[in-house]
């Protein structure tokens, strides 16, 4: 029962992680720039994401522009896009694997196979968590490096956007949820056969010892 509870908790966490990851990838808030004009009284915030950039004026008016050419984009942005999409697809695959092996489904009847599928889904979720973490940490590293680079102009310096925090949360939830699913399989994987072997070995001496005792009893 506790195992089933942990499984449910693990899946809930990974689902939350997946949603967070989706929002993080979609929102144009990876890098945030605050421009405060020196000569003219202009205040605007620029949000940069993986797919578009937005300018928010001090009036509250917002204008967004989707990046035009894929080939014209910086390689790190292309890589971040790819990793984000791959991470989300990997997590979806993990969910399908989990559903196939979940205790409440009948896709697979054999307990051992079910446990193995749950364990596999856990590993897949952990991989997804790591894949989510890479572009987020890479972007954060670039922002921080620019911040401390004296030759990067103040206007070019960025701050960590909300998407990065969502990305970290998504990664953490996927890793935690995947970890829980990996831990809820005492009868799965390599532990399964040894568990059954132990049951046979306890009863085997009684069966084998019986016939050897009968002759002695008969002779007495």
């Amino acid at each position: 029962m506790a195992s089933a509870g942990m499984q449910i908790l693990g899946v809930v966490l990974t689902l939350l992680g997946w949603v967070n990851g989706l929002v993080s990838c979609a929102l144009p808030m990876w890098k945030v720039t605050a421009f405060i004009g020196n000569s003219i009284v202009v205040a605007q915030v620029v949000w940069e994401g993986l797919w578009m950039s937005c300018v928010v004026q001090s009036t509250g008016q917002m204008q967004c522009k989707v990046y035009d050419s894929l080939l014209a984009l910086p390689q790190d942005l292309q890589a971040a896009r790819a990793l984000c999409v791959i991470a989300l697809l990997v997590a979806l695959f993990g969910l399908l694997v989990y559903l196939a092996g979940a205790k409440c489904t009948t896709c697979v009847e054999e307990k051992d196979s079910k446990a193995r599928l749950v364990l596999t889904s856990g590993i897949v979720f952990v991989i997804s968590g790591v894949l989510t973490l890479i572009p987020v940490c890479w972007t954060a590293h670039a922002i921080i490096r620019d911040f401390y680079n004296p030759l990067v102009a103040e206007a070019q310096k960025r701050e960590l956007g909300a998407s990065l925090y969502l990305g970290w949360a998504a990664s953490g939830l996927l890793l935690l949820g995947g970890g829980l699913l990996c831990c809820t399989c005492p009868s799965g994987g390599s532990q399964g056969p040894s568990h059954y072997m132990a049951r046979y070995s306890t009863s085997a001496p009684a069966i084998s010892r019986g016939p050897s005792e009968y002759p002695t009893k008969n002779y007495v």
């Epitope: 020196n38 910086p74 680079n149 004296p150 030759l151 990067v152 102009a153 206007a155 070019q156």
Partner: antibody, heavy 119, light 107 residues
Framework: EVKLVESGGGLVKPGGSLRLSCAAS????????MSWVRQTPAKRLEWVVT????????YYPDSVKGRFTISRDNAKNTLYLQMSSLRAEDTAVYYC????????????WGQGTLVTVSS | DIQMTQSPSSLSASVGDRVTITCRAS??????LAWYQQKPGKSPQLLVY???LLVDGVPSRFSGSRSGTQFSLTISSLQPEDVARYYC?????????FGSGTKLEIK
């Protein structure tokens, strides 16, 4: 108009010391990162040192670390470069440079002051 | 340290010609590259930063581009006032280093 005027250059013997000054005007001095870059007789440019707007952070290449010291007096709108243990390879025109709010790199250059290290 | 290899070291072209100066970084520097112009007897001037962005007031015939670790400064139509030395410089990490320079002359 941004104006950067270097002074203090001259002839010095190897192992000697020299202090360069850069008088800044036409902008709010304490708002900008300042640097020194030198140009050798062979016309090669070499970054020497950079100091943050407040003066709290300084950045040096290994070639001058421990020998050169950058400082600034924001009240006097002046940048300094204290050079010691000078070598022949330090012979160059030294430029005082101001960073910019919008542009990366070395945005505004002074006219330079010549430092000659020779016996 | 990151080495910046600039080529050619000198270049002679006619007015109206398209001129390209290249600079290769010894390792990845992203787009942290600036180009400077130094006219005879003058101090260097910033032309391009972040590998492709032009400083205000710089004629539009100047353009910067990047392909991996190779960077280019192109003058689409050479003018007499473009006679100068051109330097590339990276500011990816300390120490910041410059290319050896390209001396551009008019034929």
């Amino acid at each position: 108009e941004v104006k950067l005027v270097e002074s203090g250059g001259g002839l010095v013997k190897p192992g000697g010391s020299l202090r360069l000054s850069c008088a800044a005007s036409g902008f709010t001095f304490n708002s900008y990162t300042m640097s020194w870059v030198r140009q050798t007789p062979a016309k090669r440019l070499e970054w020497v040192v950079t100091i943050s707007s407040g003066g709290g952070r300084t950045y040096y290449p290994d070639s001058v670390k421990g020998r050169f010291t950058i400082s600034r007096d924001n009240a006097k709108n002046t940048l300094y470069l204290q050079m010691s243990s000078l070598r022949a390879e330090d012979t160059a025109v030294y430029y005082c440079i101001r960073g910019d709010y919008r542009y990366d790199g070395f945005a505004y250059w002074g006219q330079g002051t010549l430092v000659t290290v020779s016996s | 340290d990151i080495q910046m290899t600039q080529s050619p070291s000198s270049l002679s072209a006619s007015v109206g010609d398209r001129v390209t100066i290249t600079c290769r970084a010894s390792e990845n520097i992203d787009s942290y590259l600036a180009w400077y112009q130094q006219k005879p007897g003058k101090s260097p001037q910033l032309l391009v930063y972040a590998s492709t962005l032009l400083v205000d007031g710089v004629p539009s015939r100047f353009s910067g581009s990047r392909s991996g670790t190779q960077f280019s400064l192109t003058i689409s139509s050479l003018q007499p006032e473009d006679v100068a030395r051109y330097y590339c410089q990276h500011y990816y990490s300390i120490p910041y280093t410059f290319g050896s320079g390209t001396k551009l002359e008019i034929k």
